[in-house]
Interface confidence: medium
Amino acid sequence: ECVTQLLKDTCFEGGDITTVFTPSAKYCQVVCTYHPRCLLFTFTAESPSEDPTRWFTCVLKDSVTETLPRVNRTAAISGYSFKQCSHQISACNKDIYVDLDMKGINYNSSVAKSAQECQERCTDDVHCHFFTYATRQFPSLEHRNICLLKHTQTGTPTRITKLDKVVSGFSLKSCALSNLACIRDIFPNTVFADSNIDSVMAPDAFVCGRICTHHPGCLFFTFFSQEWPKESQRNLCLLKTSESGLPSTRIKKSKALSGFSLQSCRHSIPVFCHSSFYHDTDFLGEELDIVAAKSHEACQKLCTNAVRCQFFTYTPAQASCNEGKGKCYLKLSSNGSPTKILHGRGGISGYTLRLCKMDNECTTKIKPRIVGGTASVRGEWPWQVTLHTTSPTQRHLCGGSIIGNQWILTAAHCFYGVESPKILRVYSGILNQSEIKEDTSFFGVQEIIIHDQYKMAESGYDIALLKLETTVNYTDSQRPICLPSKGDRNVIYTDCWVTGWGYRKLRDKIQNTLQKAKIPLVTNEECQKRYRGHKITHKMICAGYREGGKDACKGDSGGPLSCKHNEVWHLVGITSWGEGCAQRERPGVYTNVVEYVDWILEKTQAV
């Protein structure tokens, strides 16, 4: 059962796993949620009745019954992890804590103009977990305006004390605000020879990489595959760090794979959601329960529904045994990973999907696309919306993309002559325009935010945000698309699609069914050659076939250029302009979304 409210002056008795320090009960709840075993917590606030050494302690707890006896205690605040809840969870914490000194290893000290600058510095430093900034009112003259960057083994402070005229806060890497470069490649036959901070068992290099991304101290990793010569090290995932934040040496070794933490682009990759099944693989761990199940998929569902289950192994039924049901072993461990992985015993293993909600909703796998054809099917492009104007009569105006539960990203040029957001309606989960009737539900628009440098589509900055009056409940037919990561400049997108209800040729009408076309990206250099009279800037991106024939057209404006990379869809472009439609050697020009990520985050995350 999901309990979100905090219990004031209440302490849970027993069940202690570990104690960490957090600046607030709210953040204690987040730490508990992200801990592999924590289900409940008790936080001690500052209080004259409490021993100051216990202030800000956050005791993480577990219980077989998912609850613990409650005891009254002044200044104690208790609650439950969000693991039991179905709503989206984020580790992003932008709060600034006044008069608190969060202790850790002070590895970097420099002068900063403001706490915000100090926080940005922390966000752009590979080692930084949190910071403390001495304000200009700080009593000690030589420490004023000093920004201390800090890290710890756990990513949380080792202690928190009251200190006048300082402020503290956390790195915003988990808010997608870091400029650190993202290296997504996994390097085969490579070992990184740097210090190990931890090791876990993993079924493949991808899971190892996700564990590294989630681990507060891991900057890169080496994974030994099941063919690794040394048997005791097979399936071992070594989590690594170095002073520079980069591997000092790459050693060529067969059957090993290495890669990097993706902490600075984690908003657009799954980190907690290990959705694959591992055949002929047994995961060992503490046994929680053994249940009969029809299939490995059913076993995964059972694990996902059991809040303490972290992973499972399913052994298929022997012929005609137990009504064709196999055994589903629900398991857990101290760190959420199997204690050992065995092969060749016929089991099928996997992980709980309960933690998928801790990843950005946009990373969720969607229905496989129908290959070929130009008409889309329902649920194929769940981020695509149709934007209607009701003045003078109701009609489709532009496309747009869901990027958050209250935000649509579209093109600025769509709003030429639109005097007020009141005349706009956003319809999501729509396949055919004919579905839209008088009583079809829609989202009203609270605000239109047009980029302040926008003049006309051809000169760039053709980007706008719509803030919806109500929030979108995510379903299979309406969910967000990921924004590309700022640190992700090396990705080459090869699977890109443009979608919309626009014209199919220059003189045509709006289409009833959502159309789709696979279109290759074109270099800006090539694009510039095709548009001699225009300036193709790096804030634009082009796509199209040399021979023409497939392109966006009138009515598609504002809609997405969606590209799939590593199983995740990214909003690479916004349909903006072009010469005619699908003309030979005239690619479509799109707003290059990665160049506007800062602008989007600034507008959508404004307090």
């Epitope: 752009d124 430093d125 400029n179 650190l180 170095s242 934040g245 000092s248 790459r250």
Partner: nanobody
């Protein structure tokens, strides 16, 4: 202390090539990453390309991909930027930077060269 000195800038026609060099001296093995940044007239600093000095990982910004190549010669302690198919919009002062972070943020680099001007014009 680390000193960085750039060279190789100049005037070149659109479509032409240039090779920038950055000679590093001092306590260079403390640097985990080196980068080329540029500043066009009236604009802010823009990251062009990064390289992880020990392991050789490389990253380019979109606008130069396929045209620019970053490389290093460890024996000479020198960083290079080979710039081909130059365009007028590549006109800028190019800076070499060194630091401990593999990052697109200028603030992550502690050491900077004085810059070399590249002008692309017919």
């Amino acid at each position: 202390q680390v000193q960085l000195v750039e060279s190789g800038g100049g005037l070149v026609q659109p479509g032409g090539s240039l090779r920038l060099s950055c000679a590093a001296s001092g306590y260079t093995y403390s640097m985990g990453a080196m980068a080329w940044f540029r500043q066009a007239p009236g604009k802010g600093l823009e990251g062009v390309s990064l390289i992880a000095t020990s392991s050789g990982f490389i990253s380019y910004t979109d606008s130069v991909k396929g045209r620019f190549t970053i490389s290093q010669d460890n024996s000479k302690n020198t960083l290079y930027l080979q710039m081909n198919s130059l365009k007028p919009e590549d006109t800028a002062v190019y800076y070499c930077a060194a630091g401990t972070q593999f990052s697109w943020s200028p603030g992550s680099y502690n050491y900077w060269g004085q810059g070399t001007l590249v002008t692309v014009s017919s």
